[in-house]
């Protein structure tokens, strides 16, 4: 019999509010055991996949995407989905990105670090849950 | 079919250098992490190196045995994988497996090359 | 570090038979652990990751069970390409480090 699968979760470093030209680094989560992780922006039909898991906890795995210089376009909606061998997840909740105008003082109030939950993460509609190979689709260079 | 290939390998005095490499094909070489194993003649297996993806920064870890003196490093465009040996000493001797992560596990590897240092 | 200690060093057993390998691990790594089969002058090859599951290719006469810092490896059935050499490794912190090996033997 097939496990359930738990959704995964998504969270970014150092935050959801990130100013101009900064990184930042979207951390998806699953159970032991993931092959790819896939982070989804706005629809399925732009991601980006990853099969480079590592260890977030004796009972999670987890992947990192990161962006080195954040632009205006790539303020949206992400979520992540993760295949485990024979299915796919159904996705985690929505993480909105938001980029602002980079300010010259340190003290500009930003996202907590690690910031996953909050008024910027939407439910995601989970109603269709079959998802194209990991090499189909739209790759990294059209994500970021 | 997943293919990696070392090559590098070879007789070297101790306080030498020798830089092994791993041609890597039939999967998506630049999202995978890639690591370096050996084995010494008639022992088991030691993790020697680790690195990670561009999504992960190339982050890249060391067996504390050989850390500052072993050298990991990746070529996607190539699909190539690196390791830069120096100040070899004679319990570097090994047989060098060159492993492709999946899911975190050592999926796949390659044949290995035999590195041998003597005086 | 974390040590895995791999018992038993040796096995013999008949064609047929089931046996089982145990590895401990000196502090918990939940399912981060994988075990591997390798033939000789062959390189290791993946028989199952995450404790539990079986990967592709796999005969479903090898299985593996266990969580924290006690696991167990398992061929039921053993068949005479089966008595090569097995280790076991965790993956839930650098260093990544592998079991001793245990070596099978036809009786």
């Known amino acids: 019999q097939e496990e359930d699968l738990p959704r995964p979760s998504i969270s970014a470093e150092p935050g959801t509010v990130i100013p101009l030209g900064s990184h930042v680094t979207f951390v998806c989560r699953g159970p032991v055991g993931v092959q790819t992780f896939r982070l989804e922006r706005d629809s399925r039909s732009t991601y980006n996949d990853t099969e480079d898991v590592s260890q977030a906890s004796p009972s999670e795995s987890e992947a990192r995407f990161r962006i080195d210089s954040v632009r205006e376009g790539n303020a949206g909606l992400y979520r992540c989905i993760y295949y485990k061998p024979p299915k796919w997840s159904e996705q985690s909740d929505y993480l909105e990105l938001l980029v602002k105008e980079s300010s010259g003082g340190p003290d500009s109030p930003d996202t907590e670090p690690g910031s996953s939950a909050g008024p910027t993460q939407r439910p995601s509609d989970n109603s269709h849950n079959e998802h194209a190979p990991a090499s189909q689709g739209l790759k990294a260079e059209h994500l970021y | 079919e997943v293919q990696l290939v070392e090559s590098g390998g070879g007789l070297v005095q101790p306080k030498g250098s020798l830089k092994l490499s791993c041609a890597a094909s039939g999967f998506t070489f630049n999202t995978n992490a890639m690591y370096w194993v050996r084995q010494a003649p008639g022992k088991g297996l030691e993790w020697v190196a680790r690195i990670r993806s561009k999504s992960s920064n190339y982050a890249t870890y060391y067996a504390d045995s050989v850390k500052d003196r072993f050298t990991i490093s990746r070529d996607d465009s190539q699909s190539m994988l690196y390791l830069q040996m120096n100040n070899l000493k004679t319990e570097d001797t090994a047989r060098y497996y060159c492993?492709?992560?999946?899911?975190?596990?050592?999926?796949?590897w390659g044949q290995g090359t035999l590195v041998t240092v003597s005086a | 570090d974390i040590q895995m200690t791999q018992s038993p060093a040796s096995q013999s057993a008949s064609l047929g038979e089931s046996v089982t390998i145990t590895c401990l691990a000196s502090?918990?790594?939940?399912?981060?652990l994988a075990w591997y089969q390798q033939k000789p002058g062959k390189s290791p090859q993946l028989l199952i990751y995450a404790a539990t599951s079986l990967a592709d290719g796999v005969p479903s006469r090898f299985s593996g069970s266990g969580s924290g810092t006690k696991f167990s490896f398992k061929i039921s059935s053993l068949q005479a390409e089966d008595f090569v050499s097995y280790y076991c490794q965790q993956l839930y912190s650098t260093p990544l480090t592998f079991g001793a090996g245990t070596k099978l033997e036809l009786k």
């Open positions: 502090q918990t790594i939940g399912t981060w």
């Open positions: 492993v492709r992560g999946g899911s975190g596990f050592f999926a796949y």
